[in-house]
Interface confidence: medium
């Protein structure tokens, strides 16, 4: 018995191609010896058609090749443009002559079945249903009605009017008549699969007087839509499955060797690899939904499928849509840190990239929530006021034109840990995702404000000082007044930074802010921070309450950053030292926005109708600087 193995019978159709794999034992000699494909003649002779030595017969010219796969111990014969003349007996084998080790293969090429001229062709997508119309003469009205599927030898019953149903069609096939019309019956087959494709015959009556109709059912697999996306960008899969599955659970899965692994579904299942960077959004009552994935990685490339089924899992015979996603590694989106680390009580400055060609676009920052289908409520934006629970500790600084805006979050708690998205109402590919990790603080903060319980008295002078370590010496220090539209930087002269010295006294490094005289509008949150050019660093926040001289009660009411600011900033510095940018968060691209509750995955943030101007990041505010007195000691 030959150790070569292959298919004993191969059946195909005229015009098609076929790939025949032959297996050989794993030896070095076998891997290197000649492989051949020959056709057996009546005399028993086997005429070589193609071999691994480069021989190619005239009848195979331009339509066949033979490829050896020594690592698999297989070789493959590919033959294209098959004709009925290719029907016959062949051998695939190894050896210098065609009498070597071989395996017999029978190839049968059939004609494309010629459909009878009265054949009705139905073309349907996989998962949909078809209603086949079967007309008959009145005299066959009392007779049995049936639909059968043609095989090579016979016609296999699908369903008949005596309620007989083929096991493959149970629950999917219905035979019925409409109204009082006794000249036509219908067969509905639902949840169509590839295997339902083929030729059917519907029949009413028996024998020569029977009415017959030929039906060709073609079941089409959806052509995958090709999607080309950049590394670190985002992709939206828009899935439109139709009204009939509007009430079913929806899913997106990725094709694996033998299954389709669910990435997300509307029943709350989510692949951990996509944590923090995926949302699924039901669009309407017509079975439309979309899935957004941000922060695309190289390994996200592949074949995706969306579908609907009550289980939230892929199911044969249910409608699907498919995509082939390619991830281009030469990305225009900058490579930023995807994880930012902060400590409790501290702050993080997150640099969000956006398309530099769209500097006037609205910028947003939202927090990804994994519950339900996932959503991303906007926390702050250039025209979106800061959410109440982030009062005094969150601001967005837009730096026009340089392709980056900064989001600063201070007074961190462990509850701030999670995933956040940077997004704009412009180029949706630039949605980026950042994971914020917050650890318990183990040392004093770098920036410290005194006094800590700040209550200013109306009409008097009030000074707060911000102490900073020597490592921030060469960085620009600033105070800003926070409002829910941003943190308005208060003008200052940074004269201390221009002084030269040889030592740094840790205790004397401070930048002070003086309110003189204190007015009611001065009440609110103030931040002390450091930055280098447009790169923001650490911040710390303090709430200044304003009271009457009588020391009456005060209420918290953060005011507009553009109110009269009567500020003196003083800085005592005695050294230049190496600048250290701590907690400089540089995110890795991820996802998206719209409305306060960003649930319409593909929709852009221009729908965010929250009003108000963004706080200025560079002192170009509307406040009058003539009211500011700068005291430098």
């Amino acid at each position: 018995k030959s150790p070569i193995f292959g298919p004993q019978e191969v059946s195909s159709i005229e015009g098609d191609s076929v790939s025949i794999t032959c297996y050989y034992p794993d030896t070095s000699v076998n891997r290197h010896t000649r492989k051949y494909w020959c056709r057996q003649g009546a005399s028993g002779m086997c005429t070589t058609l193609i071999s691994s030595n480069g021989y190619l017969s005239k009848e195979y010219s331009g339509r066949a090749n033979l490829i050896n796969f020594p690592e698999n111990n297989t070789f493959v014969i590919n033959i294209e443009q098959l004709t009925q003349d290719d029907t016959g007996s062949y051998k695939c084998g190894l050896g210098t002559s065609n009498r070597g080790l071989s395996f017999d293969v029978s190839l049968e090429v059939s004609q494309v079945p010629e459909l009878p001229s009265d054949t009705h062709v139905y073309t349907k997508d996989i998962g949909r249903n078809v209603t086949i119309e079967c007309p008959f003469k009145r005299e066959n009205a009392p007779s049995k009605k049936s639909l059968c599927k043609k095989t090579n030898q016979s016609c296999e019953l699908v369903i008949d009017s005596t309620e007989k149903v083929n096991p493959s069609y149970i629950g999917r096939a219905k035979l019925f008549m409409k109204g009082t019309d006794l000249t036509v019956f219908y067969v509905n087959i639902s949840h169509l699969t590839h295997n339902d494709a083929g030729l059917y015959i519907c029949q009413a009556g028996e024998g020569p007087s029977a009415d017959k109709k030929n039906v060709d059912l073609q079941v089409l697999a959806p052509e995958p839509e090709l999607l080309y996306k950049d590394l670190r960008s985002s992709v939206t899969f828009e899935c439109d499955l139709g009204r009939e599955v509007a009430n079913e659970a929806k899913y997106l899965c990725r094709m694996n060797k033998e299954t389709c692994d669910v990435i997300i579904n509307t029943l709350g299942k989510r692949d951990p690899d996509f944590e923090g960077r995926i949302l699924i959004t039901p669009k309407d009552d017509n079975g439309r939904f979309s899935v957004l994935i941000t922060g695309l990685r190289k390994e996200d490339a592949g074949h995706y499928q969306c579908g609907a089924h009550s289980s939230g899992l892929p199911q044969e015979g249910w409608p699907i849509q498919t995509w082939q996603l390619f991830v281009n590694e030469e990305s225009t989106i900058p490579n930023r840190r995807s994880v930012v680390k902060g400590v409790t009580g501290g702050s993080v400055a997150i640099a969000c990239p956006y398309n530099p060609k769209e500097s006037s676009s609205l910028k947003y920052w939202c927090r990804w929530e994994g519950d339900g289908n996932g959503h991303c409520p906007v926390l702050v934006g250039t025209q979106a006021q800061v959410q109440e629970e982030y009062e005094g500790r969150l601001a967005l600084f837009d730096q026009p034109g340089n392709g980056t805006y900064t989001v600063i979050l201070n007074q961190l708690t462990t509850e701030d840990a999670g995933f956040y998205w940077c997004l704009t109402n412009g180029d949706s590919r630039w949605r980026t995702t950042i994971e914020l990790q917050v650890a318990e603080a183990t040392r004093e903060p770098n920036l410290e404000v005194t006094p800590q319980n700040a209550t200013a008295v109306l009409g008097e002078t009030f000074t707060v000082s911000c102490h900073y370590p020597c490592k921030f010496y060469s960085q620009e220090k600033y105070w800003c007044k926070w409002s829910n539209k941003g943190c308005h930087i208060l003008p200052s002269h940074d004269e201390g930074a221009r002084q030269s010295s040889v030592s740094c006294d840790q205790s004397s490094q401070l930048v002070s802010m003086t309110l003189n005289p204190v007015s009611k509008e001065d009440e609110g949150w103030y931040w002390c921070g450091v930055k280098q050019g447009q790169t923001y660093g650490e911040t710390t926040a303090i709430y200044i309450a304003v009271e009457e001289r009588t020391r009456g009660s005060s209420h918290v009411n953060p005011t507009d950053a553009n109110a009269r600011a009567k500020v003196a900033l003083e800085e005592e510095v005695v050294d230049s030292s190496i600048s250290e940018k701590e907690n400089k968060a540089i995110p890795n691209p991820g996802p998206f926005a719209n409305e306060r509750e960003i649930q319409n995955v593909g929709d852009q943030a221009q729908e965010n109708r929250a009003s108000g101007d963004a706080g200025s990041a560079d002192g170009q505010s509307r406040s009058s600087s003539s009211k500011h007195h700068h005291h430098h000691h």
């Epitope: 098609d16 191609s17 076929v18 790939s19 060797k257 299954t259 389709c260 199911q315």
Partner: nanobody
Framework: EVQLVESGGRLVQAGGSLRLSCAAS????????MGWFRQAPGKEREFVAT??????????YRAEDVKGRFTISSGAAKTTVWLDMDALNPEDTAVYYC?????????????????WGQGTLVTVSS
């Protein structure tokens, strides 16, 4: 999830015939392989026969020692596969398993098949 249900196994006299049937549900693609393996008491599971559909072509594979006696065929819907066994002998006694898989490369390797039935017992008495 793909499910395979075998039937048809029973006690048969040597020289007799038997038809095993395997019905599949959940096969979501048009290209797959579906066939039969058997395992005799105390022996390894061995390949019997397989049908493979790939890009419009159909491939039939059979083990050398069953050629001429066993025939594998399928229903029109490709979801049922039959194994017709003639000239049975006591060495054919085994549990016969139906197997299916997508992208099956090495048809004789059990590890290439992802889905298996529970098995049906065929006993051939002398």
């Amino acid at each position: 999830e793909v499910q395979l249900v075998e039937s048809g196994g029973r006690l048969v006299q040597a020289g007799g015939s038997l038809r095993l049937s395997c019905a599949a549900s959940g096969l979501t693609r048009s290209d797959y392989a579906m066939g039969w393996f058997r395992q005799a008491p105390g022996k390894e599971r061995e390949f019997v026969a397989t049908l493979k559909w790939s890009e419009g072509s159909r491939f039939m594979y059979r083990a050398e020692d069953v050629k001429g006696r066993f025939t594998i065929s399928s229903g029109a819907a490709k979801t049922t596969v039959w194994l017709d066994m003639d000239a049975l002998n006591p060495e054919d006694t085994a549990v016969y398993y139906c197997a299916a898989g997508f992208n099956v490369g090495f048809v004789r390797r059990a590890s290439e098949y992802n889905f298996w039935g529970q098995g049906t017992l065929v006993t051939v008495s002398s």
